[in-house]
């Protein structure tokens, strides 16, 4: 039994490096933000017992605009600012530290995210985000998914192909 | 129009070898995260690699880490997915997606193009 993709929280990303049930992984809060006080970025792959599907925990992450960078690297309305990330420490549950994550690869401007309707031509337009998308994490992988997103779509004849699947969201740890 | 094309899939035995090339049309890698997935039959879709090619890092799925390199060459634009050492839990059909401006992710939503995925079997 292995999780699905991870969902996405607003301003930070994952790169999982295991499926695997009972697997642990952190979100980095994107460059520009940084991670709210007494949230964690922490996700654990998890199987709920009643329906024996294993799925990704909601991480409390928050991401919020770093006061320190705004005068360095103003974000232009509707973007969303990504890259370095400044590392925080973050308690892990009942004692203890959690160690500074370390920074992602990513770089800043406009987020966007694909449009998922199977068989369908899409563009996504940009807009900015409003809040953490999550996917359900228990569909088949090739049905319709259905998916919350706070990001405005538009169908064009001649945009990107997004193949059928299951499209949840997700840091980045550099090998 | 923006497209990427994947290829270089195939039957191969295991312990073999395959490249996988993703090859972009209608933009630049300049700043992209190029990420490759994969889903085999019945199974979710996992991120196997991705890399930002602005600064050239490179992310790996602990199951293909040491087997699988991934490269960019931005002269013709492509990603290439060298896979060794195949298991045959390596066959599935294999994605690759770009995001613009933004660093590597395993969430899928967060790419902005897709391409239409080749299928590889490993073959015991």
């Known amino acids: 039994i292995t999780c699905p993709p991870p969902m996405s929280v607003e301003h930070a990303d994952i790169w999982v490096k295991s499926y695997s049930l009972y697997s642990r992984e952190r979100y980095i809060c994107n460059s520009g933000f940084k991670r709210k006080a007494g949230t964690s970025s922490l996700t654990e792959c998890v199987l709920n017992k009643a329906t024996n599907v294993a799925h990704w925990t909601t991480p409390s992450l928050k991401c919020i605009r770093d006061p320190a960078l705004v005068h360095q690297r103003p974000a232009p309305p509707s973007t969303v600012t990504t890259a370095g990330v400044t590392p925080q420490p973050e308690s892990l549950s009942p004692s203890g530290k959690e160690p500074a994550a370390s920074s992602p690869s990513s770089n800043n401007t406009a987020a966007t995210t694909a449009a998922i309707v199977p068989g369908s031509q899409l563009m996504p337009s940009k807009s900015p985000s409003t809040g953490t998308t999550e996917i359900s994490s228990h569909e088949s992988s090739h049905g319709t998914p259905s998916q919350t997103t706070a990001k405005n779509w538009e169908l064009t004849a001649s945009a990107s192909h997004q193949p059928p699947g299951v499209y949840p969201q997700g840091h980045s740890d550099t090998t | 129009e923006v497209q990427l094309v994947e290829s270089g899939g195939g039957l191969v035995q295991a312990g073999g070898s395959l490249r996988l090339s993703c090859a972009a049309s209608g933009f630049t890698f300049d700043d992209y995260a190029i990420g490759w997935f994969r889903q085999a039959p019945g199974k979710e879709r996992e991120g196997v690699a991705c890399?930002?090619?602005?600064?050239?890092?490179?992310h790996y799925v602990d199951s293909v880490k040491g087997r699988f390199t991934i490269s960019s060459d931005s002269a013709d634009n492509t990603v290439y997915l060298q896979m060794n050492s195949l298991k045959p839990e390596d066959t599935a059909v294999y994605y690759c997606?770009?995001?613009?401006?933004?660093?590597?992710?395993?969430?899928?939503?967060?790419?902005?193009?897709w391409g239409q995925g080749t299928q590889v079997t490993v073959s015991s």
């Open positions: 997606a770009a995001r613009v401006r933004l660093g590597c992710t395993s969430v899928l939503a967060a790419y902005d193009y």
């Open positions: 890399i930002r090619n602005s600064d050239g890092s490179t």
